[in-house]
Amino acid sequence: GMEVRWCATSDPEQHKCGNMSEAFREAGIQPSLLCVRGTSADHCVQLIAAQEADAITLDGGAIYEAGKEHGLKPVVGEVYDQEVGTSYYAVAVVRRSSHVTIDTLKGVKSCHTGINRTVGWNVPVGYLVESGRLSVMGCDVLKAVSDYFGGSCVPGAGETSYSESLCRLCRGDSSGEGVCDKSPLERYYDYSGAFRCLAEGAGDVAFVKHSTVLENTDGKTLPSWGQALLSQDFELLCRDGSRADVTEWRQCHLARVPAHAVVVRADTDGGLIFRLLNEGQRLFSHEGSSFQMFSSEAYGQKDLLFKDSTSELVPIATQTYEAWLGHEYLHAMKGLLCDPNRLPPYLRWCVLSTPEIQKCGDMAVAFRRQRLKPEIQCVSAKSPQHCMERIQAEQVDAVTLSGEDIYTAGKTYGLVPAAGEHYAPEDSSNSYYVVAVVRRDSSHAFTLDELRGKRSCHAGFGSPAGWDVPVGALIQRGFIRPKDCDVLTAVSEFFNASCVPVNNPKNYPSSLCALCVGDEQGRNKCVGNSQERYYGYRGAFRCLVENAGDVAFVRHTTVFDNTNGHNSEPWAAELRSEDYELLCPNGARAEVSQFAACNLAQIPPHAVMVRPDTNIFTVYGLLDKAQDLFGDDHNKNGFKMFDSSNYHGQDLLFKDATVRAVPVGEKTTYRGWLGLDYVAALEGMSSQQC
């Protein structure tokens, strides 16, 4: 008949497994339980995937790997503490008197339960990497952490190359023995030790469990170091940058850590495994039973087959590793799991022109001289779309793209953002809001929903803020309904008249030029350059100002740039910004200063796009280390990442306006990076590409 082959990872575990198998057999529990010996949890996962074993209990990190790499699924979960159920929480604790937040951890002193421990290392480090706060080059997480914190105690890090930094706060036992040991010899080991490291002032932050502070403060029976500690003197760091009381761990934590779970192959009946184990726990989980499922004392070890603290096993309803782990823990694991042996030696960058090839070649040499990993290789392509095709085909790895190209790269080629560009806060030409500006007019006020039949002013055909976003948004919202994909005609019929300057028109609807005025002599009407006085964002605003149009689609800065004395041309000299308003998507009107809340979309910064199987943290890690050396346009290190002037071009590899490369954080998809409004506008336009 049917049998379930449990995989044991050590001799003591094999011993306990044999006893469990015997106990189950004597109790008549079906199907029968057999034991297979593996060398490690990883090995057992491989055996299960190869159908040479069927089940094993794994911790969260191992469940992630088993699910992601081998398609295994969790079917039975452990429950420990009734209050939290099948999980506990990883938190970051600080002294109330300090000013540390999750955003200011760089340079602070840190206390960890132990190297590779879940809440003391895996979750915090993974979270910091995944959220973009900590950049890792070449999968060297230890180096990254040692550079990031201003000294740490990470018990067990003594054997690493970075022990000076990672063990700097550790103190060993009372006689100074066992410094940085991953054992109770190190006074700052484990949950209570990491908290002690914070409480005694050695560190500024401790990465522990949700219950650690409450178990070690307020006069509970404790060793002398904790006798006087008060829980109210400590706070938790929340992911949003705020802080909270230590009792608020449900709302304020780094991640919910899933309980250990039994995993099996996707084709194995999870219900069958639960029924087997449920019969077992019914008979063998209480004091005095002939076999103890949730105790390892008899074998001189801890946590064999199951965690000793398990109170019961429960069936898992949604049998996917993602659902069991939860998004917080899942994200942290993504940030942490980086295998240096599987890291490609090269990052192949897509280049589009001779000047770009030259700059990329110089970048590759400069990076190599500084031993930055992975090394850059330059591969040419004919167009951004060709780059996307080559990346999808695994012939190239990365390219920097603009908003519209990011949309295509994500939607059509499945690419994802790995890093983004960041521009100076005052630089409104590279990332900006698209707004609909109207005259402040109480008697004839209309809203965004009432634009039909109005007169419209646009910077030019195909301009992001003047055409693509507003027209796309109006199509997406159902106001403009193109017939036979003819957007131009549909727009011309929606507005009463418009000025949409254009270069080389063909079949262009005249009403889209009806409001245009040309140059001072009345020539060059509607041309797509400054000879048309209503061309560009300034021109579109002038079209509104001079009462040719009722609404102007412009950048959020356009009104400010041309009012209150900022533009001395006669048409603008006397204008006041308060005489204009914005039309909001919710049907309201707002002051022009409210552009961040009242806009049609934000034009996103450019981003580096890669295949979804590329480790984005290594890409950002490389760029982050590189920009420390080459990011400043005045650096003396022989290469300027964000300057193209030496190559007789502009915006080569990156936009010249870039101040820094930034992590994508939670914006891990093309939609996330572009933002919902911008995507909606592009979808409105792309729905018309027949």
């Epitope: 079949n507 005249s510 030029c513």
Partner: antibody
């Protein structure tokens, strides 16, 4: 040089249908709309409608919606206009005309004379 | 539909004279007015669009002007070959509509 060569004169009976052709040359056929215009002594010039040769999309003057049907054959760079249920009022000269920078007739064919008579 | 009215069906002029042909729209057409001429036995030819922009190859004796609802085509010095029917057309809104035509006769 843009050329629009229309089919020859037609003499048809009331109630019949007719198909007038317009062969384009001297430019990329799918780049510009083709318009059709009726010229009669009674009503001077009347715009019938237009077709986008690229995708066959049409737009009609409402008064000709049930009278005319516009089609194209991209392979031969030819546009066609079918006129149905003909009456003496449909007797006229019919022009095809190519659009230009803007969406209205710029270059005209030589015209096709249609006579509807019993 | 927008109605285009050419009030003069005929205009008589002499070679070398200046002549103006007028056209009125039933509503503001934002200068989206074209002018054609049609010589006897020929098809119409585009002269002017956007009220004042001369089409390629059109002699500079032809000028257009106007705004709102009133438009004018002027021939500064009439030549014998200018004998033709002249039509205005609005290209602001479909359906495109034409004036009834003005026949220019040489005295």
């Amino acid at each position: 040089e843009v050329q629009l060569q229309q089919s020859g004169p037609e003499l048809v009976k009331p109630g019949a249908s007719v198909k007038i052709s317009c062969k384009a040359s001297g430019y990329s056929f799918t780049d510009y709309y083709l318009h059709w215009v009726k010229q009669s002594h009674v009503k001077s010039l009347e715009w019938i409608g237009r077709i986008n040769p690229y995708n066959g999309a049409t737009s009609y003057n409402q008064i000709f919606k049930d009278k005319a049907s516009l089609t194209v054959d991209k392979s031969s760079s030819t546009a066609y206009m079918d006129l149905h249920s003909l009456t003496s009022e449909d007797s006229a000269v019919y022009y095809c005309a190519r659009g230009g920078d803007y969406d209205f007739p710029w270059y005209w064919g030589q015209g096709t004379t249609l006579t509807v008579s019993p | 539909d927008i109605v285009m009215t050419q009030s003069h069906k005929f205009m008589s002029t002499s070679v070398g004279d200046r002549v103006s042909i007028t056209c009125k729209a039933s509503q503001d057409v934002y200068a989206a007015v074209a002018w054609y001429h049609q010589k006897p036995g020929q098809s119409p030819k585009l002269l002017i669009y956007w009220a004042s922009t001369r089409h390629a190859g059109v002699p500079d004796r032809f000028t257009g002007s106007g705004s709102g609802t009133d438009y004018t085509l002027t021939i500064s010095s009439v030549q014998a070959e200018d004998l033709a029917l002249y039509y205005c057309q609005q290209h602001y809104r479909t359906p495109w509509t034409f004036g009834g035509g003005t026949k220019l006769e040489i005295k």
